[in-house]
């Protein structure tokens, strides 16, 4: 069972995934985000199910693509550089779900653009964190 | 169906520039991010970079920076990769390939190739 | 730099025979890898995409599977036409890296 620290812990690296996943739906609906139109071409694909944190794997999955977009977003519109946004994302996705457990990820037939993408993890997120406090 | 057409065979000498040219079919080259890799031969193969032609911004590999150019032209939806100050080393088979985030899952991956060009430096 | 090992260098096998190649990551990588198919005078192929996922047009033998940082590439029934060299790839971050590949032979 988890303990009060785990869980506090767990909490925590929640609460600072969805504060960035926050951060980059900021910037890319930033009025001036000259780029907009075409990050919303990009595809990104949904989990199925995403209710528990082993379902983190199908974000893991578009962490690379996410990258690619926000490389076309000027820089200003972020604290951190795509690269080392996105990199401390995956620190943090891989301690939440765990690195041994493989789980596959299934995806919804219908894709999302990067603003419905990032609306759905940070739904996830903020669901998580209220079955923890 | 997208496909990648390479220019020819080249033959350099020690010091020289090579271009090599890939014209994309079937789409718009702006649809894709442009990598090139090569392989020595009988060897592995090996990533150099990306651009975007979109934007022409680039990726490079370590290795090739400073010495490789990757450009794009989106009026001919044709990549280049020009390698300079070429060594006997740089004799290989150069590929062209793609990867896209507008299509589906498996288009993220190097799904389509090109032919590839044969690039021999040699005194 | 991520290194990809892949074992063994060359595998010798009948038609028939189940492959098993094997590529092992020197880090996390997720699934961000890739398998492919190359024949002599060719471009690789891709077979298999985020570790398992089957490309379009790849017969149903080739399969791919993950084991932390460990990657299998199986073939369940060799076809004459499965003879070639294979390489992993990975795309967890750039320089993308390839495997130094395993070559495939009939025995």
């Known amino acids: 069972a988890p303990t009060s620290s785990s869980t506090k812990k767990t909490q925590l690296q929640l609460e600072h995934l969805l504060l960035d996943l926050q951060m980059i739906l900021n910037g890319i609906n930033n009025y001036k985000n000259p780029k907009l139109t075409r990050m919303l071409t990009f595809k990104f694909y949904m989990p199925k199910k995403a209710t528990e944190l082993k379902h983190l794997q199908c974000l893991e999955e578009e962490l690379g693509p996410l990258e690619e977009v926000l490389n076309l977003a000027q820089s200003k519109n972020f604290h951190l550089r795509p690269r080392d946004l996105i990199s401390n994302i995956r620190v943090i996705v891989l301690e939440l779900k765990g690195s041994e457990t493989t789980f596959m990820c299934e995806y919804a037939d219908e894709t999302a653009t990067i603003v419905e993408f990032l609306n759905r993890w940070i739904t996830f997120c903020q669901s998580i964190i209220s079955t923890l406090t | 169906q997208v496909q990648l057409v390479q220019s020819g065979a080249e033959v350099k000498k020690p010091g020289a520039t090579v271009k090599i040219s890939c014209k994309v079919s079937?789409?718009?080259?702006?649809?894709?991010?442009m990598h090139w890799v090569r392989q020595a031969p009988g060897q592995g193969l090996e990533w150099i970079g990306r651009?975007?032609?979109?934007?022409?911004?680039?990726k490079y590999a370590e290795n090739f920076k400073g010495r490789v150019t990757i450009t794009a032209d989106t009026s001919t939806d044709t990549a280049y990769m020009e390698l300079s100050s070429l060594r006997s080393e740089d004799t290989a088979v150069y590929y062209c390939?793609?990867?896209?985030?507008?299509?589906?899952?498996?288009?993220?991956?190097?799904?389509?190739w090109g032919q590839g060009t044969l690039v021999t430096v040699s005194s | 730099d991520i290194v990809l090992t892949q074992s063994p260098a060359t595998l010798s096998l009948s038609p028939g025979e189940r492959a098993t190649l094997s590529c092992q990551a020197s880090q996390y990588i997720g699934n961000y890898l890739s398998w492919y198919q190359q024949k002599p005078g060719q471009a690789p192929r891709l077979l298999i995409y985020s570790a398992t996922s089957l490309a379009s047009g790849i017969p149903a033998r080739f399969s791919g599977s993950r084991s932390g940082t460990d990657f299998t590439l199986t073939i369940s029934s060799l076809e004459p036409e499965d003879f070639a060299v294979y390489y992993c790839?990975?795309?967890?971050?750039?320089?993308?890296?390839f495997g130094q590949g395993t070559k495939l032979e009939i025995k």
């Open positions: 651009i975007d032609p979109d934007d022409d911004s680039t």
């Open positions: 079937g789409d718009t080259i702006t649809a894709y991010y």
């Open positions: 390939t793609t990867i896209t985030f507008l299509y589906s899952r498996e288009l993220r991956w190097f799904a389509y």
């Open positions: 790839l990975q795309h967890y971050s750039t320089p993308y890296t």
